[in-house]
Amino acid sequence: LPAQVAFTPYAPEPGSTCRLREYYDQTAQMCCSKCSPGQHAKVFCTKTSDTVCDSCEDSTYTQLWNWVPECLSCGSRCSSDQVETQACTREQNRICTCRPGWYCALSKQEGCRLCAPLRKCRPGFGVARPGTETSDVVCKPCAPGTFSNTTSSTDICRPHQICNVVAIPGNASMDAVCTSTSPTRSMAPGAVHLPQPVSTRSQHTQPTPEPSTAPSTSFLLPMGPSPPAEGSTGD
């Protein structure tokens, strides 16, 4: 004979569990039906009657098969630094994630509770580790032979251009300035020629500069104040 199919509510066999989409009710001591996602238990089961389910009200939800007396409230509206990536429906909570240029400083069950702007590396510092959805940018000082002249959360330290003749040597926050190889007759005081790179910026080795035709005072031009040690703006 085929095994009898029990209809909810029913008493489970000792030591056995209820079936899929059923739960064991402590009070009734019976296996009872769960409510589907988007619903909640309006009336709990008894020994003689099964669970009565009802739809979640506006701005509330249940995502799981359940027997909760009330649906859960959807989270508050997303803040100005966030984007709503999932709307509040009867079956799912609202999810807010950080907008571009921000990262999640404090996450919650799903989405983000608190967004913060990505750190910007100051001139003389480049991005050592890019920001992610959940971590801030890490800045590092530009190593000798490299520079960054921007305040940016994405720019890395780039190699100085390599000159035949250096007008102004590069530093951590400024590229090298090259001069033309042919001597200039009427060079206005303080005039700087446009850079004339010999090779691409991808070269990381810097050969010894050839003797410069520019006046030696060009090495003493003020370079501006040094950036603070942390290398990031307080934006």
Epitope: T17, Y23, Y24, Q26, C32, T62, Q63, L64, W67, L72
Partner: nanobody, 123 residues
Framework: EVQLVESGGGLVQPGGSLRLSCAAS????????VAWFRQAPGKEREEVSC????????NYADSVKGRFTISRDNAKNMVYLQMNKLKPEDTARYYC????????????????WGQGTQVTVSS
């Protein structure tokens, strides 16, 4: 729906300690209240400890208060039962079970169960 696997049981001397683990798959455990039950041969299944789905509230049977501690690690989808100062009467098979969105302990009802892990306290 969530599936549960218990581990960490074993043979231990009176006064000893064990840490039981309840690992979940199929769903995120942080949506569920989780309870540890135990059942000794010929005895009723009893709820030993419970933690609400928010983790804000815990509950213990009088027989284990001050000796057992329940905790959850939502990132690992795990719930733990730290059992200290074990007694021979703690000998039983230990099970974890869940209640979706369960906000109070003890649980109003039980969802799926694992196969359990045996704890034997004997000298």
């Amino acid at each position: 729906e969530v599936q549960l696997v218990e581990s960490g049981g074993g043979l231990v001397q009176p006064g000893g300690s064990l840490r039981l683990s309840c690992a979940a798959s199929g769903s995120r455990l942080d949506y569920y209240a989780v309870a540890w039950f135990r059942q000794a041969p010929g005895k009723e299944r009893e709820e030993v400890s419970c933690i609400t789905y928010s983790g804000g509230s815990t509950n213990y049977a009088d027989s284990v208060k001050g000796r057992f501690t329940i905790s959850r690690d939502n990132a690992k989808n795990m719930v733990y039962l730290q059992m200290n100062k074990l007694k021979p009467e703690d000998t039983a098979r230990y099970y974890c079970t869940t209640e979706p969105y369960g906000s109070s302990c003890p649980l109003s009802g039980y969802d799926t169960w694992g196969q359990g892990t045996q704890v034997t306290v004997s000298s």
